[in-house]
């Protein structure tokens, strides 16, 4: 129940007043304003947008709005020396070259400063050699090549299709396999939905469209030159050779027209099975090298991009809390885009802008939230979550003591089918209760709740009558808050129908064709899905900042801990003899989960009964809830990933976008049958079970009665 001591508005109308103030027409207007020119991180245009947002947030009524700047490592193509890939004949002549830019969309022909497609942070180089097609370049794809097909990628240039996993993982895998270059391409099987036209006539990717993106493996480090600390004016910077997460081989992205020219000549081994075939009219041969007539031809990459320390700007707005100003609820999303950012990020930034406007309107009427709300427009997200991470590094001591929750606000839509939510289990009940109060925007669900349409279209695989809520992974600005600092986090957006649309992300992701018109014509002409996402994100922030008792249910954590313990145990039980031989037991983990369940249940009972008029007891109970997420943080971090410190969740080591539960144990068990030294390998499994069991038990004890 929302209420606040310091408001002129009747308590029960607080949330309603806030939600009623949100307008689809405003979101549309803001999106248009944010997408007319590119806003690449580190450019003057993005600095100007930061100042515009600062000014408008002040006008909207926030108490203060400041720019927080950092000097971080970014990457840009060389303007006079373009990147491209060629096929060369035996004399070294270039007989085919990939395109140097995407054909601009209608109406944007005269826009300057459209960065050509490139893989950010690729080193320079001009490798040449035979091509090997590696499917999605996932761990399992390289296992197939290496172990089953006996194909050696050492000294080869590999070509991989985008999709399934984060591109940085693809590059890391290729590097480990000994490749000397990587070509990334968008296959129509993944980026062209059947029955839909290409842009500008539909929302599909044209053959000349290319996905930009960074190829770092930062593992939560932030700026590659200042891991763990803010990239401020007195920062000590590592040398480039010691920088975190930079790729060591040249990488370049291309579209499917150019990919066709490379793949159609491929010889060598046939694809191992149909899962290696895309939708191009090519054989999808694995190689190495070209077929008979073309066997003397090679592929050559020409990469001339440069890494440069560049200033970036976050916008940080504050709406001071009336009762608990030292408790922070954060709503953050990024502002920088690869080109126009029609979806990523400006569909999210426009929603944040409207949420700020609505909160500002209430504040001007005399209302204040109970807790402080911080609003953030992050910079350089596309270059490795740099703006958010640097700010969190600079403010880590405040955040770990005062951070209640972080709600992420990148792209509001990646489709228009149903809601998608990833969050901490602490927020499950908040999301359920909120979506039951909101109207569904979906056709065929008029007059029904968002909860109902969401549950119907995206049912939970475990609990009937409930919607699917996913684990947090990474690839967005919540990472530092959740995975490093242990602040309860969540994200929500509208998504596609994953059952019928098997393509990865949305087809025009990170291309020049991600424009305002893409959204306005094809995804959300009425901006009703944007409005719904604004209501979900804004409603979550409102409740987190305003409810007397924090809207966290620790019992939901108990449920998932049991589920995750069962899952990791069943993975381990694929090795029953080794578990006996090396005395591997999960008893300690299951015992800790049982204790957590019992203590969480008792805590929830006390939460119903305590005297909410006693501010000391109220604060004590709220602090136990706030610090529960923090209790899952291991200060030592995960093995070889010191900035991923959450013991229950981490980004998958094989796909940064995906979340993995009990990641320490999972990674210790992964491919354990190929570890040469089984006693050492199973010893590490035992150590990780110990860490997990201890952490769960320690977290449980934070919920016990304090004395």
């Amino acid at each position: 129940k929302s209420s606040n001591e310091a408001t002129n508005i009747t308590p029960k109308h607080n949330m309603k007043a806030f939600l009623d103030e949100l307008k689809a027409e405003n979101i549309k207007k803001f999106l248009y304003n944010f997408t007319q020119i590119p806003h690449l991180a580190g450019t003057e245009q993005n600095f100007q947008l930061a100042k515009q947002i600062q000014s408008q947030w002040k006008e909207f009524g926030l108490d203060s709005v400041e720019l927080a700047h950092y000097d971080v490592l970014l990457s840009y193509p060389n303007k006079t020396h373009p990147n491209y890939i060629s096929i060369i004949n035996e004399d070294g002549n270039e007989i085919f070259n990939t395109s140097l830019f995407e054909p601009p969309p209608p109406g944007y022909e005269n826009v300057s400063d459209i960065v050509p497609p490139f893989s950010a942070f690729s080193p320079q180089g001009m490798p040449e050699g035979d091509l090997v097609y590696v499917n999605y370049a996932r761990t399992e794809d390289f296992f197939k090549l290496e172990r089953d097909m006996k194909i050696n990628c050492s000294g080869k240039i590999v070509i991989a299709r985008y999709g399934k996993v984060f591109r940085g993982n693809k590059v890391k895998n290729a590097q480990l396999a000994g490749a000397k270059g990587v070509i990334l391409y968008s296959d129509p099987a993944d980026y062209f939905a059947p029955g839909v036209k290409s842009y500008p006539d539909g929302w599909n990717l044209p053959g000349g469209g290319v996905q930009r993106g960074n190829i770092l493996n930062l593992n939560g480090a932030g700026d590659p030159l200042t891991p763990g600390y803010p990239a401020n004016e007195y920062a000590y910077r590592r040398g480039i050779a010691e920088a975190v997460g930079l790729p060591s081989i040249p990488v370049h992205p291309i579209g499917y027209y150019d990919a066709q020219k490379l793949l159609e000549k491929m010889g060598g081994s046939a694809p191992p099975d149909s899962s290696w075939r895309g939708s191009l009219k090519v054989p999808y041969n694995v190689g190495p090298g070209f077929t008979g007539n073309f066997s003397t031809q090679k592929v050559k990459m020409h990469i001339h991009s440069t890494n440069e320390v560049t200033r970036i700007y976050n916008v940080i707005g504050t709406l001071r809390g009336a009762v608990e100003p030292d408790r922070y609820v954060i709503l953050g999303g990024h502002r920088d885009s690869w080109v126009f950012g029609g979806i990523d990020p400006q569909s999210g930034a426009a929603v944040v802008h409207e949420i700020v406007r609505s909160f500002g309107t209430l504040k001007k009427e005399g209302w204040r939230p109970r807790r402080t709300i911080l609003f953030a427009s992050w910079d350089a997200e596309e270059f490795g979550l740099l703006g958010s991470t640097e700010w969190a590094e600079e403010n880590s001591r405040l955040l770990q003591e005062r951070g209640v929750a972080y709600i992420n606000a990148d792209s509001s839509i990646e489709g228009n089918y149903t809601l998608r939510v990833d969050c901490t289990p602490l927020m499950y009940s908040l999301v359920h209760n909120l979506t039951k109060e909101l109207k569904s925007p979906d056709e065929g669900f008029e007059g029904k709740s968002l909860y109902e349409s969401w549950t119907k279209k995206s049912p939970s695989p475990e609990f009937s009558g409930m919607p699917r809520i996913s684990k947090l992974g990474s690839g967005n600005d919540f990472e530092v808050f959740f995975q490093r600092l242990g602040i309860a986090s969540g994200r929500a957006r509208y998504t596609k129908n994953w059952e019928t649309n098997k393509f990865s992300g949305y087809p025009l992701y990170h291309s020049v064709y991600e424009t305002y018109e893409l959204v306005e014509k094809f995804y959300d002409p009425m901006f009703k899905y944007h409005l719904t996402v604004a209501q979900v994100r804004g409603g979550m922030v409102f409740e987190l900042a305003n409810s007397i008792v924090l809207p966290f249910d620790c019992r939901d954590y108990a449920v998932v801990l049991r589920k995750y313990a069962d899952k990791i145990y069943s993975i381990s039980m694929k090795h029953p003899q080794e578990m006996k031989t090396y005395s591997v037991s999960f008893d300690s983990l299951f015992s800790a989960v049982k204790n957590f369940t019992e203590i969480a249940s008792k805590f929830s009972e006390r939460l119903q009964d305590f005297d909410k008029s006693n501010p000391i007891v109220l604060r004590m109970m709220n602090d136990q809830l706030m610090f529960l997420e923090r209790a899952f943080i291991d200060p030592l971090g995960l093995p070889d990933r010191p900035f991923y410190r959450h013991v229950i969740y981490a980004p998958s080591s094989h796909n940064k976008y995906a979340g993995e539960s009990f990641p320490g144990i999972y990674d210790a068990l992964f491919d354990i049958e190929s570890k040469v030294d089984p006693s050492k390998a199973w010893g590490e499994v035992k150590r990780q079970i110990y860490v997990a069991a201890f952490t769960v038990q320690a977290a449980a004890e934070t919920l016990s009665e304090v004395a």
Partner: antibody, heavy 119, light 112 residues
């Protein structure tokens, strides 16, 4: 404790057959590629054959010297590896070891069983 | 097939002194993933081979730290910093980068 125990060796005439067994314990046999390696008296080690796991359709490969005559097989339910040796020759005389592969390394070896091919 | 050549054939040693065995392959043993699948085994008299060093330089569990491996490409070395009486036997290098997997001819280490 990981154990591999070979059996089935003995004296056999040239041209005849013999079947070796390797009973294993202490590890989940079905998860691992298994090999046979042999050592002629007073000589060095020679790799003979490998069999993969169920997910790889129990694929096998052989040294040229035994191809077409020897067949490697496994019975996962019994955690046992076999080597069927046909058309035996004098040069097949050796101690035969079964070995468990881990990450492309032969890590654990049995104590061996001696096969003598003699008329 | 890859030929593995070990030198010396025989190595008489004094306890407490260092010893070194060389192994040369007829082709590079560098595999993809940057791995070099060159391993060392010791076969003590009347016993089966036991793994000492895997992938050039990694000591297997329980192997004393007086044993070390080094090398790259085609040239590899096993060193024993201070030989002990229990180290006698035949040492084999082995490559598993290329099929078929092959072994060196062995080096017999005996106490002087």
């Amino acid at each position: 404790e990981v154990q591999l125990v070979e059996s089935g060796g003995g004296v056999v005439q040239p041209g005849r057959s013999l079947r070796l067994s390797c009973a294993t314990s202490g590890f989940t046999f079905s998860n691992y590629r298994m090999h046979w390696v042999r050592q002629a008296p007073g000589k060095g080690l020679e790799w003979v054959a490998v069999i993969t796991v169920k997910s790889d359709n129990y694929g096998s490969s052989y040294a040229e010297s035994v191809k077409g005559r020897f067949a490697i097989s496994r019975e996962d339910s019994k955690s046992t590896l076999y080597l069927q040796m046909n058309s035996l020759r004098a040069e097949d005389t050796a101690v035969y070891y079964c070995s468990r592969e881990l990450g492309q390394v032969l890590v654990f070896w049995g104590q061996g069983t001696l096969v003598t091919v003699s008329s | 097939d890859i030929v593995m050549t070990q030198t010396p054939l025989s190595l008489p040693v004094t306890p407490g002194e260092p010893a070194s065995i060389s192994c040369r392959s007829s082709q590079s043993l560098v595999h993809s993933y940057g791995n070099t699948y060159l391993h060392w085994y010791l076969q003590k008299p009347g016993q089966s081979p036991q793994l000492l060093i895997y992938k050039v330089s990694n000591r297997f569990s329980g192997v004393p730290d007086r044993f070390s491996g080094s090398g790259s490409g085609t040239d590899f070395t096993l060193k024993i910093s201070r030989v002990e009486a229990e180290d006698v036997g035949v040492y084999y290098c082995s490559q598993t980068t290329h099929v078929p997997w092959t072994f060196g001819g062995g080096t017999k280490v005996e106490i002087k």
